[in-house]
């Protein structure tokens, strides 16, 4: 049966605090647009920070996490959590392999695939990225607008630039260099 590639819709980068606190492993989308993010090396966060629960690092339970470009004085429009298309946290590895294969064929959808060849959603490789994001946002608020990831491959490219574990840099994919968000 043919299946359409999932998660190709435009990603809304405005997230609610519920989305962050519920999820142990928010993806790189929660940390949009840092200046020259790809040009800097990977953060090494102290163990005590890495092990701290996410909600202990958030300003308050009711605070919304928004794009850095939003002025703190402007209240962002209310966002329905259910309407946000979030990337999955734990896709099986072979799904990523299928996605790479499809990209190599230069096609994104409309392919009639055998049962085992399912189109993929990229691996979520940043389980602690929101912690790094929070720390960065406190020290450096960019005035640049967030990247508009309307294209699936752009998201994948952006996510691949972030190591999956700040303390496990050796795990970052071979095709991407570890980066530093600081």
């Amino acid at each position: 049966t043919g299946t359409k590639i999932a998660y190709e819709t435009k990603v809304d980068l405005v997230q609610t605090s519920e989305a962050i606190q519920e999820s142990l492993y928010p993806t790189a989308q929660l940390c949009p647009s840092f200046e020259e993010a790809e040009a800097t090396p990977s953060p090494v966060l102290p163990d005590i920070v890495m092990e701290a629960p996410l909600n202990s690092l958030l300003p308050s339970a009711g605070a919304s996490v928004v794009q850095p470009s939003v002025s703190p004085l402007e209240a962002p429009p209310p966002v329905s959590y259910d309407s946000i298309k979030l990337e999955p946290e734990n896709p099986p590895p072979y799904e990523e392999a299928m996605n790479v294969a499809l990209k190599a064929l230069g096609t994104k959808e409309g392919i009639k695939e055998p049962e085992s060849f399912n189109a993929a959603v990229q691996e979520t490789e940043a389980p602690y990225i929101s912690i790094a994001c929070d720390l960065i946002k406190e020290t450096k608020l960019s005035t640049e607008p967030s990247p508009d990831f309307s294209n699936y491959s752009e998201i994948a490219k952006f996510e691949k630039s972030v190591p999956e574990h700040a303390e496990l840099v050796e795990d970052s994919s071979p095709e991407s260099e570890p980066v530093d968000l600081f």
Epitope: D82, N90, P91, P92, P93, Y94, N118, E123, S173, E175
Partner: antibody, heavy 118, light 112 residues
Framework: EVKLLESGGGLVQPGGSLKLSCVVS????????MSWVRQAPGKGLEWIGE????????NYTPSLKDKFIISRDNAKNTLYLQVSTVRSEDTALYYC???????????WGQGTSVTVSS | DVLLTQTPLTLSITIGQPASISCKSS???????????LNWLLQRPGQSPKRLIY???KLDSGVPDRFTGSGSGTDFTLKISRVEAEDLGLYYC?????????FGGGTKLEIK
């Protein structure tokens, strides 16, 4: 605290069908692929299949693909497994799993037992 | 499907002694992303399986460091440096590199 609570097992006659449920709490169900795994008495683990967060992708192990239907209801934080035309070899403990390959935090339910007997 | 063969089927160990379990795969488990998606699980009697190790050698949180995983390609090993009473149960390897996911047949660790 993470919980995966399976239910719906029990005694079923050969040729019958049943629907197992797994209610999830403690993590963001709506962002997770979920799987079903079964274990026949005294036997090893057998992967049944998996479903992606928005139900647009469902993979089954090829040999079992006509036997099972996996579905989910994100509003209810619930995963389902429909088992059709059951036979004695479907007698097993059925586990709901949130598998994670890249990092820690792999979760298994306690299992629900299905016995096929006339 | 990828066949995972575990040996031995049963391992009878005295408490305090080391133990080693092998898992051989019918094809390489090295993924195109450079990682190897092999897990080790422990199922204690009457309990659900619990993952001990992921990505061949990384310990899950709360797992004692007497457990170590090693290997690459098609050959993998789980070692317990000093077996304790709580380690008894069934050990499974589990691969996620290739579709469909598959489990090894299991190794029963019993205490002498």
């Amino acid at each position: 605290e993470v919980k995966l609570l399976e239910s719906g097992g029990g005694l079923v006659q050969p040729g019958g069908s049943l629907k197992l449920s797994c209610v999830v709490s403690g993590f963001d169900f709506r962002r997770n692929w979920m799987s079903w795994v079964r274990q026949a008495p005294g036997k090893g683990l057998e992967w049944i299949g998996e479903i992606n967060p928005d139900s647009s992708k469902i993979n089954y192990t090829p040999s079992l693909k006509d036997k099972f239907i996996i579905s989910r209801d994100n509003a209810k934080n619930t995963l389902y497994l429909q088992v059709s035309t059951v036979r004695s070899e479907d007698t097993a403990l059925y586990y709901c799993v949130r598998p994670v390959w890249m990092y820690a935090m792999d979760y298994w339910g306690q299992g629900t037992s299905v016995t096929v007997s006339s | 499907d990828v066949l995972l063969t575990q040996t031995p089927l049963t391992l009878s160990i005295t408490i305090g002694q080391p133990a080693s379990i092998s898992c051989k795969s019918s094809q390489s488990l090295l993924h195109s992303d450079g990682k190897t998606y092999l897990n080790w699980l422990l199922q204690r009697p009457g309990q659900s399986p619990k993952r001990l190790i992921y990505l061949v050698s990384k310990l899950d949180s709360g797992v004692p460091d007497r457990f170590t995983g090693s290997g690459s390609g098609t050959d993998f090993t789980l070692k317990i440096s000093r077996v304790e009473a709580e380690d008894l149960g069934l050990y499974y390897c589990w691969q996620g590199t290739h579709f469909p996911q598959t489990f090894g047949g299991g190794t029963k660790l019993e205490i002498k």
